[in-house]
Amino acid sequence: RDKVMSEFNNNFRQQMENYPKNNHTASILDRMQADFKCCGAANYTDWEKIPSMSKNRVPDSCCINVTVGCGINFNEKAIHKEGCVEKIGGWLRKNVLEQKLISEEDLGGEQKLISEEDLHHHHHH
C-alpha cells in the first residue's frame, strides 16, 4: 500500500509539472481537484514550485467556488487547502483497490492516475 501511495504521489507531481504545457493533463488534474475538493499533491503550496505556472496562482479548479481567474492572487480561505494525494489515495484504497483488487503495478508511473469511469463514479457519489 505504501508503494501504491508513493507511485501515485510521484505520478501526481509529475502531472503537475505538465499542467501548464499539456491541455489534456490539465483537464484531468482540474477534474480531480474539483471533484475531490483538493489542491496540489500535499497541499496548495505545491503549485508554487511549478516553474511554468504564473506566480501567485493555483489552478481555478482549486477554488471552493470555481470561476474563471479565481486562482490568481487567491485568498487562502477561498481554495481547498487539502492535498490531493492523501485525499484521492484514501478514496482509491477504499473504493478501487479493495473492490477491484488492482495490483500495485497497475498504478505505475506511466499509467493513468485514475480511470475516467472511476472519476465519473466519484462525481456522482
Partner: antibody, heavy 120, light 108 residues
C-alpha cells in the same frame, strides 16, 4: 521598501462628502488586497472597507455601508475611499493597509493615516 | 458578526516580565487570528498572523498560540519598546474584519 501614504483628510460638515487617497509604492500593488481602517480619537481600531487585487470583491462595515465606496486604480498604484453623507461618528484617523498575498484580511503594512473631522 | 474580546483591557508589567494577553472569539475562527502592536501616535504593526506565525522582522520574544475561540499573545521577556497597545483581529468570517478592543500594556 513598502510605503503607503494617505491624503485627503479634512474638516467637513455633517452631510458633506470627502475622498481619501492612498498612494502605494515599494511592492507590486496589483497583486494585493487593500483596506481602510479607522481609529476614532482615543478609541480602538475599526475596519471600514476592503477591496481585492482586481476589484472583484469589496466589503464594508455595516456602519458605512451605502455611504462609503472603496475603489482602486492599479495603473496609478492608488486606493480610494469615497465618503458621502458624513456623520460626526465618522471622525477618525483613517489608515490605508495592505493585505497579505494569500490572506487578504491580514494587514502587514499600514500608512500613517489621514485625519477626517466631521463637525459643524 | 464575530465579536473579539481581549483581556485584560490594561496591565502593568516590568521590563523582563513574561506577559500574556488573551483574545476570545464569539465563535470558532479556526486559526485566523492576528495580533497587532500600536504605539502612541503611530500606525499599527503586524506581529503575528494565522495565530502563531511570526511576521518577518518581529523579535522572537513575541509568540502566539491557540485555535478555535481562545488565543494568546505572549511576550517572553518584556523590553522597554514593548510598552504599547495590542489588538487581536479575526480574519475568518469576513466581511467585516473585526478587532478586539485592545490591551494597553503599561510600565509598572
Amino acid at each position: 521598501e513598502v510605503q503607503l501614504v494617505e491624503s485627503g483628510g479634512a474638516l467637513v460638515q455633517p452631510g458633506r462628502s470627502l475622498r481619501l487617497s492612498c498612494a502605494a509604492s515599494g511592492f507590486t500593488f496589483d497583486d494585493y488586497a487593500m483596506h481602510w481602517v479607522r481609529q476614532a480619537p482615543g478609541k480602538g481600531l475599526e475596519w471600514v472597507s476592503g477591496i481585492s487585487w482586481n476589484s472583484g470583491t469589496m466589503g464594508y462595515a455595516d456602519s458605512v455601508k451605502g455611504r462609503f465606496t472603496i475603489s482602486r486604480d492599479n495603473a496609478k498604484k492608488s486606493l480610494y475611499l469615497q465618503m458621502n453623507s458624513l456623520r460626526a461618528e465618522d471622525t477618525a484617523l483613517y489608515y490605508c493597509g495592505k493585505g497579505l498575498l494569500h490572506q487578504w484580511e491580514v494587514l502587514d503594512y499600514w500608512g500613517q493615516g489621514t485625519l477626517v473631522t466631521v463637525s459643524s | 458578526d464575530i465579536q473579539m474580546t481581549q483581556s485584560p483591557s490594561s496591565l502593568s508589567a516590568s521590563v523582563g516580565d513574561r506577559v500574556t494577553i488573551t483574545c476570545r472569539a464569539s465563535q470558532s475562527i479556526s486559526s485566523y487570528l492576528n495580533w497587532y502592536q500600536q504605539k502612541p501616535g503611530k500606525a499599527p504593526k503586524l506581529l503575528i498572523y494565522a495565530a502563531s506565525s511570526l511576521q518577518s522582522g518581529v523579535p522572537s520574544r513575541f509568540s502566539g498560540s491557540g485555535s478555535g475561540t481562545d488565543f494568546t499573545l505572549t511576550i517572553s521577556s518584556l523590553q522597554p519598546e514593548d510598552f504599547a497597545t495590542y489588538y487581536c483581529q479575526q480574519s475568518y468570517s469576513t466581511p467585516p474584519i473585526t478587532f478586539g478592543q485592545g490591551t494597553r500594556l503599561e510600565i509598572k
